[in-house]
């Protein structure tokens, strides 16, 4: 199931790259699967927020990103994820790449990786 989520994530990243005009030489942070959830590509200076993933939910490859990006002038709409929400994890896209998640998954979500045993 987790291999499938990873594959779905890579599909979503590819589509996002096309929509955003990203390529391998583009400045910014590439989309990634971090073994817990899927992060979309971002420009330097952007913060990406994701809600805690449901442990055994299968990604729908056609779904929109369950993330929001906060840039200098884009703070999302009233329905967007917000840093004031519990169960939200953020990463900053810096010139050196993605920052560590804040809060860490374990503190924000109660787990820090998918378990190999069920």
């Amino acid at each position: 199931i987790f291999k499938k989520e990873q594959a779905m994530c890579l599909e979503k990243i590819q589509r996002a790259n096309e929509l955003m005009g990203f390529n391998d030489s583009s400045p910014g942070c590439p989309g990634m699967w971090d073994n817990i959830t899927c992060w979309k590509p971002a420009h330097v200076g952007e913060m990406v927020l994701v809600s805690c993933p449901e442990l055994f939910r299968i990604f729908n490859p056609d779904q929109v990103w369950e993330t929001e990006t906060i840039g200098e002038s884009d703070f999302g709409d009233s329905n967007s994820l917000d840093l004031s929400d519990m169960g939200v994890v953020s990463r900053n896209c810096t010139e050196d790449g993605w920052s560590e998640p804040f809060p860490h998954y374990f503190d924000a979500c109660g787990f820090d990786e998918y378990e190999s045993e069920t």
């Epitope: 503190d107 787990f111 378990e115 190999s116």
Partner: antibody, heavy 123, light 107 residues
Framework: QVQLQQSGPGLVKPSQTLSLTCAIS??????????WNWIRQSPSRGLEWLGR?????????HYAVSVKSRITINPDTSKSQFSLQLNSVTPEDTAVYYC?????????????WGQGTLVTVSS | DIQMTQSPSSLSASVGDRITITCRAS??????LNWYQQKPGKAPKLLIY???NLQSGIPSRFSGSGSGTDFTLTINSLQPEDFATYFC?????????FGPGTKVDIK
């Protein structure tokens, strides 16, 4: 009813190793929804979280940076207990040491505590 | 590490009073904030978790509020058994740091 019972010496000499054990009843140290923590309290430092162990298909530990080089927290599944070892102690490690269970519900909180053990570091 | 401060450090009150204790975090912690009560010679006891959720078995006269960096613990109609020391603790990031405590004693 979850209960945590602490045991271990109350006096440790400087440079030696502080060793305490926390026996769990009413729960299992392998509970995938819990963490098992050590906290200490002294007049100078107040309440200080030292670290935790937990099982999520494999055993993991998180330690406070202030003691990371000296601390080991080990689970013992056969006895459903966990232990604290603090090496190279100094008088500044004199404190009341508590074990506690961490539970998740929107955040991690410590909902069951041991009775506390006063450990004095002195020659 | 995230630093936690509390005010006041101590307060004197009478049975039946309504008291408020404040806790401030040195950085943004959303609502990852817990409150504990401790009596002399005893271990701390969880009162409130995630800013405002009352732990099972805790009387409803205890309540918590706040988000971001500023939080409060309120005790309505103080009872004799409430005279104790109260600690806040952040849970957004290990190490989970505690406030220095607020001692509530009888006026």
């Amino acid at each position: 009813q979850v209960q945590l019972q602490q045991s271990g010496p109350g006096l440790v000499k400087p440079s030696q190793t502080l060793s305490l054990t926390c026996a769990i009843s009413g729960d299992s140290v392998s509970n995938r929804l819990a963490t098992w923590n050590w906290i200490r309290q002294s007049p100078s430092r107040g309440l200080e979280w030292l670290g935790r162990t937990y099982y999520r298909g494999k055993w993991k530990n998180h330690y406070a940076v202030s003691v990371k080089s000296r601390i080991t927290i080990n689970p013992d599944t056969s006895k459903s207990q966990f232990s604290l070892q603090l090496n190279s102690v100094t008088p500044e490690d004199t404190a009341v040491y508590y074990c506690a269970r961490g539970t998740w519900n929107q955040d991690w909180f410590l909902d069951h505590w041991g009775q506390g053990t006063l450990v004095t570091v002195s020659s | 590490d995230i630093q936690m401060t509390q005010s006041p450090s101590s307060l004197s009150a009478s049975v039946g009073d309504r008291i408020t204790i404040t806790c401030r975090a040195s950085q943004y912690i959303v609502r990852y904030l817990n409150w504990y009560q401790q009596k002399p010679g005893k271990a701390p006891k969880l009162l409130i978790y995630a800013s405002y959720n009352l732990q099972s078995g805790i009387p409803s006269r205890f309540s918590g509020s706040g988000s971001g960096t500023d939080f409060t613990l309120t005790i309505n109609s103080l009872q004799p058994e409430d005279f104790a020391t109260y600690f806040c603790q952040q849970a957004i990031m290990a190490p989970y740091t505690f406030g220095p405590g607020t001692k509530v004693d009888i006026k």
